[in-house]
Each structure stands twice: as structure tokens, then as C-alpha cells.
């Protein structure tokens, strides 16, 4: 061994200086008699070594590194040997920090595993091997006087928790507990906890269950849930308080908390919930009034609240068959009266014959928003209800009366955009109570069953914007009927488009007669198409061989046109443009040649 390094300290605070000396023995005869000692930290050469020959002939180099900023590095003492650097000796240097005081020490008593589990936060990284030890002792009082020491609890590497087994615990008696952290640069201790393991007991939660419905018990009200829980038996004798949390399964609602509940409640009716809604519920408990820790939340229980009877207003409208006036088509729309108006399962139309107390004849039961039935001859009125499993809405009477009220006037319609139509009118005198507006495809696609309708509750309204089921390029029939106290007025109707289509093609041009300076053209007009506006005019265009263009505007009833002032023996390109308010379309181009001056006219 030719060289040997010694250091002031192999482990230092990060950033602190470190001094090292390297001694080369004299008997390394193969070396240069005056060798130059070099220092290297990691891969970098370090300047600043002070070299001297000692009295015994050995060479010594001393270096001071002002700041050791590597948490781990090798310091080497080297010589130049030929072209390479020869390492004579090296030492490992480490730098870091003494352990910070462990903080947030807390413990939980687990009655099932019969152990006290303590955990802590170790603090910032020390960059050095640091050991943690959970230390404790038994104490009769408030930990001022130390009783028997308990065996140290050493966590597995890298863990910040440790379990003290039951054999080292005394329940209902205080223990002093702290964490000691130790590394090469120092030792630190957490503040001491003084606790009775039972005061940090963490229980298991009860198991939530749905209550078995008993025949004599009343079913839960709408928006209520009946549930019960099975206490965790090993904690049965511990007085506890519990809390329940619940939230609807759908949507983004946060948990709502209910409590405190005594563990012994065992069964509970939870109200104030949304009807007909699936809820997730959980329960947790804590030792109380004595100290303890909250249990985890129990596994979820999923329950559905009962629904409430529909709370809706039913707007109704009806129509009689022209061929059979006793066959009635009844339409309705549910209008919620509350934010949560209850689910609607179906609708029933019924009639109560006069003089037959209690006898109600159902005329139809449907999930649709209309039904057709035969009205008994003596029936002037039927009742409509919406229903679900919880009951029915308030009955809506529907009275079948003649049209005896005044009619509205000046019914008109205009397009707002391709998907809406505005229908306006002048209200009759006296004001109606409201209006029914119906709309659907006009002829030839008209159908009574496919009409959309709306009730306008304001009798002073002078118009209504139709936004449902309106498509461009379709002709709509709009029917408006005023409604009065016990009757209605006659229905008025109007036709309208929300958007019309330009002509799809212009008629083909045909040459009928031609001369030297004229040409007679004709065409067959396109038949009118529904959804397309009527033609407003034609424009005929012709262009000569010199690319000069000419045009003439013709009215929409034109069937032909004579071009005059043409050049003899000349080529012309001609096309027809058919125009409506919605746009214009060109025909195909007709090319012709006028006759030569010596030729005879063609007819």
C-alpha cells in the first residue's frame, strides 16, 4: 500500500468544510522521488493541495475542501503514472443533516389486532442513514413519573409507523410515547404523547342494512328511507355516537351529514330526501363521551326513496272526429307545479255517470300524451289524472262544449328563422282565457294525428313563437282556437313556411323558329313544388361569339321569347334563369347559329 488518506470526519453537515491528508511512503521505489500528489473528488480534480516532504522521507499532501456539497462522493489521492492517473487511496465522504424532530405523532388502538399503531412524519430528508425508534413506558399518573419501560418498537426500513403489541400495553392506564430519530450527525426526539390506549381506540363501523318491511308498519313517506344498522360486536359495549352521510347516486351532489345518532338507535327513518331517488348511505361511529377516533365509513348501502304522487297541472285539448262526433281525441301536457313534481307512470281518462255514486268508468289508460275514445252519449265531461305508484294527481276536468265564443281575427304567420315561425292574431272581444295553437305539416302531408300543440294561458297574448317541430322547406298549417270560460271560439288557420327553397331547376330551352337576325325560343314551366316559393320572374341570357352578353327579364307566366337583332350566320349561347324569392337556378345552355344572308327562314 503506497498511499493512505485520513480525513477530519467522513460524515459532515452538507456544505461544511472537510480536511484530508494523503501520505505516500518512501519505500514505493517505483515512484518518482519527488512525486506530485493530486486530489480528485468524484471525477473532478481538486486544486489546493499543500505538499511537503516529511523527515522520514514520506510525502504528505493536505487539502481542505471548503464546502462539501455532495451528499455522497469518493475523495481520491492520485499520482500521474505515465499518461494516466493512478489512485493510491480513496475514502467515501457523506454529507447531510442531523434528523429533524419527528412531528405529528399519533396513535390508534385497534381492538381486533390488539395493538397500538403509532405513526409520525419523519421530517425533511437527511441524506444519511437515519433510524427511527418508537419508545414508550407505562405510567400510573399523567406520564410525569416513568414506570416500566416498554420494549422499543423499530419500524421496517422506510416506514413511519410501528405497532406496539398487546402484551406491552396496559389498557385504562397512561403510556408515555415518543419517537427518537438518530443518524451520524445527531439525535432528535418528538414531543411525548401521554395516552391511555383506550382513548385512541378506532372502532369498526356498523353494517348498514335496509329494514325488512313488516306488514303492520307503515311504509316510509315520500322522500324518506327506513334503515337499520348492525353494531360492530366487539365494540358493542363501548358507548358511541354515530353519524350517517348520504348523497344521490346520480349527479354531482356532495355528501349530506346526519347526526349525532346514538349507536343504539339501530334503526332510523331518514327524511327530507328527494322522492324516487337512489341514494348511497354510509355510517361511522366514535367512542363517546369518552375520547376515541372516528371509525372508517361503513360499506355503502344503496336504497331508493319512495316516490310521491304526481303534482302537475294537465293542460288539455280535444278534437272530435268529423265522421263520428262521439269519437273524441284528447290531448294533454303535464306542467310541473313544483321543482320535483313526481314521476308520471301513466294517465287515466275516466267518466263518472250521473246518479251512479262511486261508479267510475275508465275510458283509457295510457303512457302517451293523447288518447282516442268513444264518449258516452250522456257524457259532457271526463276527468284526466296522472298517476304513479304513490297515487294520482288532482283530477283535471275536461268539458266537451260547442264552439260558442267569438273568433279571433287577422291570423297571420311569418318565418323567424329556418326552425321557428311566428303566428300572430288580433284578440277577440271579450278577451279569451287563453288559446290553443296547433301546427303540423300542411297539404299534401297534412295529418291530424301528427300535430304539435301548445296552450297559451294568457288571453291577452297577440302571438306565439312556434319552435317545436319546425323544419325548413315544409309548408305548415297553423290553427289557433280561442278558449273561454265554458266554451271555445271557432278555429282559424293559416299556412306558412319557415324557409323556402330556391327552384331546383329551370325549364329546358327549345328552338322553335330561327331566321337570319332572330330566333324564337320556348320552354315548358316546371310544375309548382311544395316547399318551394313560386317563381317571380325569368331572365334569359344570350352571348355572341365575341363574348358580348345580353339579357331580358320576363314575367313568371312566360312560355317563350323571341331574340331580335342577331347577326346573320353567327353562333349564340343562350340560357334561362328561373327566380323566386328564395333564389335562382339556371337552365342548361342552348347553342344556335343564325341563318346566312342568302338562306331562307326556318319555321
Amino acid at each position: 500500500e503506497c498511499g493512505h488518506i485520513s480525513v477530519s470526519a467522513p460524515i459532515v453537515h452538507l456544505g461544511d468544510p472537510i480536511t484530508a491528508s494523503c501520505i505516500i511512503k518512501q519505500n514505493c521505489s517505483h515512484l518518482d522521488p519527488e512525486p506530485q500528489i493530486l486530489w480528485r473528488l468524484g471525477a473532478e480534480l481538486q486544486p489546493g493541495g499543500r505538499q511537503q516532504r516529511l523527515s522520514d522521507g514520506t510525502q504528505e499532501s493536505i487539502i481542505t475542501l471548503p464546502h462539501l456539497n455532495h451528499t455522497q462522493a469518493f475523495l481520491s489521492c492520485c499520482l500521474n503514472w505515465g499518461n494516466s492517473l493512478q489512485i493510491l487511496d480513496q475514502v467515501e465522504l457523506r454529507a447531510g443533516y442531523p434528523p429533524a424532530i419527528p412531528h405529528n405523532l399519533s396513535c390508534l388502538m385497534n381492538l381486533t389486532t390488539s395493538s397500538l399503531i403509532c405513526q409520525w412524519e419523519p421530517g425533511p430528508e437527511t441524506h444519511l442513514p437515519t433510524s427511527f425508534t418508537l419508545k414508550s413506558f407505562k405510567s400510573r399518573g399523567n406520564c410525569q413519573t416513568q414506570g416500566d419501560s416498554i420494549l422499543d418498537c423499530v419500524p421496517k426500513d422506510g416506514q413511519s409507523h410501528c405497532c406496539i403489541p398487546r402484551k406491552h400495553l396496559l389498557l385504562y392506564q397512561n403510556m408515555g410515547i415518543w419517537v427518537q430519530a438518530e443518524n451520524a450527525l445527531g439525535t432528535s426526539m418528538s414531543p411525548q404523547l401521554c395516552l391511555d390506549p383506550m382513548d385512541v381506540v378506532k372502532l369498526e363501523p356498523p353494517m348498514l342494512r335496509t329494514m325488512d318491511p313488516s306488514p303492520e308498519a307503515a311504509p316510509p313517506q315520500a322522500g324518506c328511507l327506513q334503515l337499520c344498522w348492525e353494531p360492530w360486536q366487539p365494540g358493542l359495549h363501548i358507548n358511541q355516537k354515530c353519524e350517517l352521510r348520504h348523497k344521490p347516486q346520480r349527479g354531482e351532489a356532495s355528501w349530506a351529514l346526519v347526526g349525532p345518532l346514538p349507536l343504539e338507535a339501530l334503526q332510523y327513518e331518514l327524511c327530507g330526501l328527494l322522492p324516487a331517488t337512489a341514494y348511497t348511505l354510509q355510517i361511522r361511529c366514535i367512542r363517546w363521551p369518552l375520547p376515541g377516533h372516528w371509525s372508517d365509513w361503513s360499506p355503502s348501502l344503496e336504497l331508493r326513496t319512495t316516490e310521491r304522487a304526481p303534482t302537475v297541472r294537465l293542460d288539455t285539448w280535444w278534437r272530435q272526429r268529423q265522421l263520428d262526433p262521439r269519437t273524441v281525441q284528447l290531448f294533454w301536457k303535464p306542467v310541473p307545479l313544483e321543482e320535483d313534481s313526481g314521476r308520471i307512470q301513466g294517465y287515466v281518462v275516466s267518466w263518472r255517470p250521473s246518479g251512479q255514486a262511486g261508479a267510475i268508468l275508465p275510458l283509457c289508460n295510457t303512457t302517451e300524451l293523447s288518447c282516442t275514445f268513444h264518449l258516452p252519449s250522456e257524457a259532457q265531461e271526463v276527468a284526466l289524472v296522472a298517476y304513479n305508484s304513490a297515487g294520482t294527481s288532482r283530477p283535471t276536468p275536461v268539458v266537451f262544449s260547442e264552439s260558442r265564443g267569438p273568433a279571433l281575427t287577422r291570423l297571420h304567420a311569418m318565418a323567424r328563422d329556418p326552425h321557428s315561425l311566428w303566428v300572430g292574431w288580433e284578440p277577440p272581444n271579450p278577451w279569451p282565457q287563453g288559446y290553443v295553437i296547433e301546427w303540423g305539416l300542411g297539404p299534401p302531408s297534412a295529418s291530424n294525428s301528427n300535430k304539435t300543440w301548445r296552450m297559451e294561458q294568457n288571453g291577452r297574448a297577440t302571438g306565439f313563437l312556434l319552435k317545436e317541430n319546425i323544419r325548413p322547406f315544409q309548408l305548415y298549417e297553423i290553427i289557433v282556437t280561442p278558449l273561454y270560460q265554458d266554451t271555445m271560439g271557432p278555429s282559424q288557420h293559416v299556412y306558412a313556411y319557415s324557409q323556402e327553397m330556391a327552384p331546383s331547376h329551370a325549364p329546358e330551352l327549345h328552338l322553335k323558329h330561327i331566321g337570319k337576325t332572330w330566333a324564337q325560343l320556348e320552354w315548358v314551366p316546371e310544375p309548382p313544388e311544395l316547399g318551394k316559393s313560386p317563381l317571380t320572374h325569368y331572365t334569359i341570357f344570350w352571348t355572341n361569339a365575341q363574348n358580348q352578353s345580353f339579357s331580358a327579364i320576363l314575367n313568371a307566366s312566360s312560355r317563350g321569347f323571341v331574340l331580335h337583332g342577331l347577326e346573320p350566320a353567327s353562333l349564340y349561347h343562350i340560357h334561362l334563369m328561373a327566380a323566386s324569392q328564395a333564389g335562382a337556378t339556371n337552365s342548361t345552355v342552348l347553342t344556335l347559329m343564325t341563318l346566312t344572308p342568302e338562306g331562307s327562314e326556318l319555321h
Epitope: 381492538l111 381486533t112 389486532t113 390488539s114 398487546r166 402484551k167 389498557l171 383506550m198 353494531p231 360486536q233 366487539p234 358493542l236 359495549h237 363501548i238 358507548n239 346514538p262 343504539e264 338507535a265 339501530l266 367512542r287 363521551p289
Partner: antibody, heavy 118, light 107 residues
């Protein structure tokens, strides 16, 4: 000092009824589970029933279920055991006991003898 | 229901002897095992709770150990006042049950 004093024992015919009482003092009665344990002559101990601190939970041994009813009156610091349809095998010393949080019987009364015989 | 089996049912020992009584549960009961001492004509008295915790006022010669299904009550040096019947009791699950008892007699 905790004291539990049973009363109400005695001789009763099979099929008859008896009500045992246990007067408690020296601790906050309403915070503790209470229970009854019996011991037939020359035999071991048998748990009969317990009752939670506010009376909401009342487990029973299978041998007495449906016949015995445990109850308590926290305002009177008193525990009760109503025994109906008594049988000869119910003959025993009945002890009233205060329970601890881990289900141990912390304190016991001196016991009251119930004899079921014709 | 959990069955508690105590052994031996009786034993004879002398003052100063070390005495061990065992109790076995038919299924795991963690540490929910309590030991009682009963002298003739008297009410039982709690000695050990939760398997190994000495009840206040009980001499330290009494100790308990075990967990799960097998438990032991040890009297390190038997004293004249220790001659009595000893019972174990599980309190983890309802119904709570006692062992059949072990009678410790003077040899």
C-alpha cells in the same frame, strides 16, 4: 364505592313469573351496560342477558329468549329482569353485574336465589 | 355460538406453586378474553380483562396471555387465598359465554 344490590328472588312454581331488581350506586349508572349472570347450584356461570346504557340494545341467551325481558330505569339507577314461563332449569343464583367497555363484568352484586319448583 | 373450553376442570397444588389454566375458544376472539375468580358462596371477581390486562387491585402474581383461540391464566406463586374456582369468558361476540371453570384445590 360501587354497590349492586339484587332483590326479588324467591320460590316460584313452574310457569310462574318473577321480577328481579338491581339497585346500583357509586358510579354513573346511565353510562354503563349492565347484565345478568346466573349460576345453578353446583354449576358454572351462565350469561343471561345484557342491556346497553340507554336500553336500546338487549341481547339474550338462547335459553331465556322470549321468556325473560331485561330493562333499566336510569332515573332510578335500577336494572330489572322480568322472568316469565319459569322452568325448573331456571333455578339459580342470579347476579347483577356492571359491564366494562370490552365486555368484561367489572363489578358483581351478591346475588339473589330464584327457585322454580312445584 | 362460541364454545369456551377450560382445562383442567380441577387441579391440586401447593402454596408457592406455579399454576397454569388454559381456555380455548371454538373460534377466534382476538383478545376478548376475561378471567374471574370465585370463592364458595361469593360473587365472582374480575382478575384479567382483554387477555392480559390486570384489573385494579389484583395481585401481580396473576397474569394472562394468548390471543385468537388459546389463552392462559398463570398464578406465578400460589397463595392460600388463591384456592378458588376460575372462569374464563369471551366478550367478542354475542352471546357471551363462560368456560366450565377450573377448581384449584389444596394438595
Amino acid at each position: 364505592e360501587v354497590q349492586l344490590l339484587e332483590s326479588g328472588g324467591g320460590l316460584v312454581q313452574p310457569g310462574g313469573s318473577l321480577r328481579l331488581s338491581c339497585a346500583a350506586s357509586g358510579f354513573t349508572f346511565s353510562l354503563y351496560w349492565m347484565g345478568w349472570v346466573r349460576q345453578a347450584p353446583g354449576k358454572g356461570l351462565e350469561w343471561v342477558s345484557s342491556i346497553s346504557s340507554s336500553g336500546g340494545v338487549t341481547p339474550y341467551a338462547d335459553s331465556v329468549k322470549g321468556r325473560f325481558t331485561i330493562s333499566r330505569d336510569n332515573s332510578k339507577n335500577t336494572l330489572y329482569l322480568q322472568m316469565n314461563s319459569l322452568r325448573a332449569e331456571d333455578t339459580a343464583v342470579y347476579y347483577c353485574a356492571k359491564l366494562g367497555e370490552l365486555g368484561m363484568f367489572l363489578e358483581w352484586g351478591q346475588g339473589t336465589l330464584v327457585t322454580v319448583s312445584s | 355460538d362460541i364454545q369456551m373450553t377450560q382445562s383442567p376442570s380441577s387441579l391440586s397444588a401447593s402454596v408457592g406453586d406455579r399454576v397454569t389454566i388454559t381456555c380455548r375458544a371454538s373460534q377466534g376472539i382476538s383478545s376478548y378474553l376475561n378471567w374471574y375468580q370465585q370463592k364458595p358462596g361469593k360473587a365472582p371477581k374480575l382478575l384479567i380483562y382483554y387477555a392480559s390486562n390486570l384489573q385494579n387491585g389484583v395481585p401481580s402474581r396473576f397474569s394472562g396471555s394468548g390471543s385468537g383461540t388459546d389463552f392462559t391464566l398463570t398464578i406465578s406463586s400460589l397463595q392460600p387465598e388463591d384456592f378458588a374456582t376460575y372462569y374464563c369468558q369471551q366478550s367478542m361476540w354475542m352471546p357471551m359465554g363462560f368456560g366450565g371453570g377450573t377448581k384449584v384445590e389444596i394438595k
